[in-house]
């Protein structure tokens, strides 16, 4: 084997010493020396560091601002950041979930293909032939046209992607 060419994985080089990094949840106070060890301190309340590090300051936990429609999905620890999500009826505008927007509704003629979540918007699809949607909704799928035949009725008015068919009684033959 070759001679060593670097400090070990959880170490960093400073002043000819391979010093231990600080563990997640702790920040660096002072580097190690020939006689002293790396000095680390736990992050304070509402702070975190999620990796082995030599940071002198911990990061602040993310604030889930209710004015932006945000709420806490998972409380942060000294080793993890807070995870925000959106209030009911809203979804994140980005992966980082820094703000929220209202779920969009599907217009008449369109139905909901996928209901929105805290992180994704509503996905709409046009109602195909044989289906309709006459409302603007974030939940309603396209409904199938009514089957007049099963009701012993006939189609009096054809359906569209926005309206149902209109059924009526069959014409009676005069004697």
């Amino acid at each position: 084997p070759e001679p060593p060419t670097a400090c070990r994985e959880k170490q960093y080089l400073i002043n000819s010493q391979c010093c231990s990094l600080c563990q997640p949840g702790q920040k660096l106070v002072s580097d190690c020396t020939e006689f002293t060890e790396t000095e680390c301190l736990p992050c304070g309340e509402s702070e975190f560091l999620d990796t082995w590090n030599r940071e002198t300051h911990c990061h602040q936990h993310k604030y889930c601002d209710p004015n932006l429609g945000l709420r806490v999905q998972q409380k942060g620890t000294s080793e993890t950041d807070t995870i925000c999500t959106c209030e009911e009826g809203w979804h994140c505008t980005s992966e980082a979930c820094e703000s929220c927007v209202l779920h969009r509704s599907c217009s008449p003629g369109f139905g909901v293909k996928q209901i929105a979540t805290g992180v994704s918007d509503t996905i709409c699809e046009p109602c195909p032939v044989g289906f309709f949607s006459n409302v603007s909704s974030a939940f309603e799928k396209c409904h199938p046209w009514t089957s007049c035949e099963t009701k012993d009725l006939v189609v009096q008015q054809a359906g569209t992607n926005k309206t149902d068919v209109v059924c009526g009684p069959q014409d009676r033959l005069r004697a």
Epitope: P1, E2, P3, P4, T5, A6, C7, R8, E9, K10, Q11, L13, S16, Q17, C18, S20, L21, C22, Q23, E37, T38, C40
Partner: antibody, heavy 125, light 107 residues
């Protein structure tokens, strides 16, 4: 201060196993590799292997492969060395020692900068 | 494995004497050599690394030299606390290997 405190002396019969512990204090235990070495009566030092306390990865000397197991418990900052199928020539003082890499004059080298007090293991029928 | 050969295996000396211990590596190890001192019943402690660098706190009467395959440790004026066993160790490759030791006894 940095300290490695080992478990007490053991007397074992041939064929048995022994498990020696090494409790670290005064430094970030997962941050430095731990070596295990032994010294037979009146003999030199013999390296048995190392354990990376962070990952649990090990590297054993060829001579001890299949007989030695090094483990660690990071929650109590303790490394363990178990040697099985003991023979009389395993009678020795067993040491744990912290590996401290340094950089000097443009090259790296590994040093055993802190040692445990040693654990005497006697194998006798 | 790299063979480390130390000589002499033991020596008798008096307080104030100049003492030199040699260590030979079975292959070129550049300057990847550490010296350890071991007092009776105690764990070894680092004396010199690598080859000639003296850690702070180690008395200046100790000195190391050499590179490649031939190394030496010199104690310029032996003191009562210097009696014990001295080991050389190569850190060039795994496994790290040690010399057989040199026991320095009181004459």
């Amino acid at each position: 201060q940095v300290q490695l405190v080992q478990s007490g002396a053991e007397v074992k019969k041939p064929g048995a196993s022994v498990k020696v512990s090494c409790k670290a204090s005064g430094y970030t235990f997962p941050g430095y590799y731990m070596y295990w070495l032994r010294q037979a009566p009146g003999q030199g030092l013999e390296w048995m292997g190392w354990i990376n306390p962070d990952s649990g990865d090990t590297n054993y000397a060829q001579k001890f492969q299949g007989r030695v197991t090094m483990t660690r418990d990071t929650s109590i900052s303790t490394a363990f060395m178990e040697l099985s199928r003991l023979r009389s020539d395993d009678t020795a003082v067993y040491y744990c020692a912290r590996e401290k890499p340094r950089y000097f004059d443009s090259f790296y080298y590994y040093l055993m900068d802190v040692w445990g007090q040693g654990t005497t293991v006697t194998v006798s029928s | 494995d790299i063979q480390m050969t130390q000589s002499p295996s033991s020596l008798s000396a008096s307080v104030g004497d100049r003492v030199t211990i040699t260590c030979r590596a079975g292959q070129n190890i550049a300057r990847h050599l550490n010296w350890y001192q071991q007092n009776p019943g105690k764990a070894p402690k680092v004396l010199i690394h690598p080859a000639s660098s003296l850690p702070s706190g180690v008395p200046s009467r100790f000195s190391g030299s050499g590179s490649g395959t031939d190394f030496s440790l010199t104690i310029s004026s032996l003191q009562p606390e210097d009696f014990g066993t001295y080991f050389c160790q190569q850190s060039y490759s795994t496994p790290p290997t040690f010399g057989g030791g040199t026991k320095v006894e009181l004459k």
